[in-house]
């Protein structure tokens, strides 16, 4: 069947070999069955990405505890639900603890390092700089357009996009979601932020969907720089020597 594909994740292999000939899709790199009606978890997406590589003033000040993803790509360990395992290690037995977004939140150690829990990232601050425009975007229009985007494209419940700040040419999008607020079917802010980040970079994860084309009253929003800050429910545990900015 040519229509056996995963609309929300192009990094999958799909077939109709399952019970009753139902279309089933598995994430590349992990072979985990994914739900194609919603976003795939960031952990499985990162794992798929790594497997593919192997084969071929109104603005918010980020909190002092906010962390940037300085380490970039790695091949993560995911649990049976596709979430990041608390402890991640590389091939040379260097290990570290991560948050629910998969970003390192401790110093690196050896295999004796203990990570008791996956600390939830409950606040994500996405900071964008847009390309030149002859007129600044209307804040209200920009706010509406970005809220529509997160709700319609990423299926994020509107209550989890807490604010859109704008001070030309910088846009900040605040996503907030406590563990107690997230329902079973709710998209995780970590996954919505990752899909958005990939869209902004022109690397859409959606199958066959045209790239991101955000327009505010007819003016296209061209993003030329992105920074994403992650704030966890518990402060990160870095030693004092790690005081360099991301």
């Amino acid at each position: 069947q040519s229509n056996c594909t995963c609309p929300t994740n192009k990094m999958t292999v799909c077939d109709t070999n399952g019970p009753g000939g139902v279309c089933q899709c598995r994430a590349m790199g992990s072979q985990v069955l994914v739900d194609c009606s919603t976003l795939t978890s960031k952990c499985l997406l990162l794992k798929a990405r790594m497997s593919a590589r192997k084969s071929g003033r109104s603005l918010v000040m980020p909190s002092e505890h906010a962390i940037l993803d300085n380490d970039g790509l790695y091949d993560p360990e995911c649990d049976d639900k596709g979430r990041f395992k608390a402890r991640q290690c590389n091939q040379t037995s260097v290990c570290w603890c991560v948050n629910s977004v998969g970003v390192r939140r401790t110093d690196k150690g050896d295999q004796s390092l203990r990570c008791d829990e996956v600390v939830r990232t409950h606040h994500i601050l996405i900071e964008l700089r847009h390309r030149p425009t002859d007129r600044a975007f209307n804040h209200s229009d920009l706010d509406s357009e970005l809220r529509r985007l997160f709700q319609e494209r990423y299926k994020l419940h509107p209550s989890f996009l807490s604010a859109v700040h704008y001070e030309e040419p910088t846009i900040q999008i605040e996503l907030r979601q406590n563990a107690s607020q997230k329902g079973l079917r709710d998209v995780d802010i970590a996954d919505a932020a990752y899909y958005f980040e990939r869209d902004i970079k022109g690397e859409s994860l959606f199958m066959g969907r045209r790239g991101l084309d955000v327009q505010v009253r007819g003016e296209p929003l061209h993003v030329e720089r992105t920074l994403i800050y992650y704030l966890d429910e518990k402060p990160p545990q870095f030693s004092m020597k790690r005081l360099t900015a991301g």
Partner: antibody, heavy 123, light 109 residues
Framework: AVTLDESGGGLQTPGGALSLVCKGS????????MGWVRQAPGKGLEYVAA???????GYGAAVKGRATISKDTGQSTVRLQLNNLRAEDTATYYC?????????????????WGHGTEVIVSS | ALALTQPSSVSANPGETVEITCSGG????????YGWYQQKAPGSAPVTVI????KRPSNIPSRFSGSTSGSTNTLTITGVQADDEAVYYC?????????FGAGTTLTVL
């Protein structure tokens, strides 16, 4: 392939009006800023006017107050109207396409040019 | 009004690397934007070799590159060829209007 075809040039009389049209093809016309750049004989390039995808406009100092730039997205055309023509408006006029849509002012974004249409203002 | 500054002429032997600088463009919240346009003969249509500081159209050879340091942009032609002989104009922005430099004539010896 992106193509930009200018028309409307030729011999014009001082004090008269000029209307140049550029038709674009091979790209989504509505998504990009478009503009006009001219070159007088023996001189360098000069920004004339541009219009963003959202229809905001910009004009060069030499034509401000005399020029109007507009577009017809349905026809994929951009038009330059230049009134009160002077001898110094004599030049080859090039249609230019921006690689982006948001600004009419950044000639740093031009990624494609037309072949040009020659305008001579003389009595 | 701002004025873009670029050298009036540069020359090089085939195979050498040529750098042409352009400065004086307006900034958009601390970032400067430049483009480079090649014109082989007066009255012939310009060709974009670099736009948006570093981007190269798909039809332009990889020997052309652009880089920005502060408010200055540099067009670099690595391994210059006889066919690269032309006038190179830089373009930027000045308070709601585009501006061009006076042009740099590249002579390939």
């Amino acid at each position: 392939a992106v193509t930009l075809d200018e028309s409307g040039g030729g011999l014009q009389t001082p004090g008269g009006a000029l209307s140049l049209v550029c038709k674009g093809s091979g790209f989504t016309f509505s998504s990009y800023a478009m503009g006009w750049v001219r070159q007088a004989p023996g001189k360098g390039l000069e920004y004339v006017a541009a219009i963003s995808s959202g229809s905001s406009t910009g004009y060069g100092a030499a034509v401000k107050g005399r020029a109007t730039i507009s577009k017809d997205t349905g026809q994929s055309t951009v038009r330059l109207q230049l009134n009160n023509l002077r001898a110094e408006d004599t030049a080859t006029y090039y249609c230019a396409k921006s690689g982006y849509g948001g600004s009419a002012s950044y000639v740093s974004d031009i990624d494609a040019w037309g072949h040009g249409t020659e305008v001579i203002v003389s009595s | 009004a701002l004025a873009l500054t670029q050298p009036s002429s540069v020359s090089a032997n085939p195979g050498e690397t040529v750098e042409i600088t352009c400065s004086g463009g307006g900034d958009y919240y601390g970032t400067y934007y430049y483009g480079w346009y090649q014109q082989k003969a007066p009255g012939s249509a310009p060709v974009t070799v670099i736009y948006d500081n570093t981007k190269r159209p798909s039809n332009i050879p990889s020997r052309f590159s652009g880089s920005t340091s502060g408010s200055t942009n540099t067009l670099t032609i690595t391994g210059v060829q006889a066919d690269d002989e032309a006038v190179y104009y830089c373009g930027s922005y000045d308070s709601s209007a585009g501006i061009f430099g006076a042009g740099t004539t590249l002579t390939v010896l």
